[in-house]
Interface confidence: medium
Amino acid sequence: KLLQVSTIAMQQQEKLIQQERALLNFTEWKRSCALQMKYCQAFMQNSLSSAHNSSPCPNNWIQNRESCYYVSEIWSIWHTSQENCLKEGSTLLQIESKEEMDFITGSLRKIKGSYDYWVGLSQDGHSGRWLWQDGSSPSPGLLPAERSQSANQVCGYVKSNSLLSSNCSTWKYFICEKYALRSSV
């Protein structure tokens, strides 16, 4: 009888663990969906506004291949930086390769020097995984150096030629990115 009760308890424990896991997956999926939605809205907005503009990038944006970059002149906390980029039909910078990282850091050296710039990278509170704003994981060579000892949410930023991490509530410049308009010629 005791063994039966013990088996039932173990089964229920296992069921509970599975439900918790499912809930965590659902929460991550919901977060990813919300971000994807924002990402798509920004892309649509970019496409529509670009249709009226013949140059690949708007004024004061820098072009590299298929991307346009905007280096902000204001400081914001990370979340507001993302909102500021979305208002411009863009998102916080997502660094896809070492080549892109080199272009960004080279451009920053020319523009402003050694300041801190938020990028679209944040650490998931539950799993501790680094995620770009579209829900994807950065490549191993593009993981922030562990610099933040913050108990608060941690986000990624670029300084000089490094990717670092900091409390998302600190104030930094930021970099927005959107697709360059393809020439219809």
Partner: nanobody, 124 residues
């Protein structure tokens, strides 16, 4: 031309208080949010507090919540930062900055819209 002038810094013992002032000129005060920032030697600048002139909303960094209070006097075009229960880790140059005019809330500050700063040293 936006001009901001901080004052009120000084040397104070741990647990003591200081009141910083930020006098603004060259722009319509009501159209901006004003933020207080600080920078300790070798550290990045951090936002301490901010007050939005449009709706009076305030922002405080977790490290100063419950100890610092931001307020403003429209007639004098001045924003104040009352700092109580000061700690050695509050030691820094404190400066105020004006919000980018297009947003009117504590969302973004320009480097060229800030004052020269006032030194606050907390030490026994």
């Amino acid at each position: 031309q936006v001009q901001l002038q901080e004052s009120g810094g000084g040397l104070v013992q741990p647990g003591g208080s200081l009141r910083l002032s930020c006098a603004a000129s060259g722009f319509t005060f009501d159209d901006y949010a004003i933020g207080w920032f600080r920078q300790a030697p070798g550290k990045e600048h951090e936002g301490v507090s901010c007050i939005s002139r449009s709706d009076g909303s305030t922002y405080y960094d977790d490290s100063v919540k419950g100890r610092f209070t931001i307020s403003s006097d429209n007639a004098k075009n001045t924003v104040y930062l009352q700092m109580n229960s000061l700690k050695p880790e509050d030691t820094a140059v404190y400066y105020c900055a004006a919000e980018v005019p297009s947003t009117y809330s504590c969302s973004g500050f320009r480097e060229d819209y800030k004052g020269k700063g006032t030194q606050v040293t907390v030490s026994s």
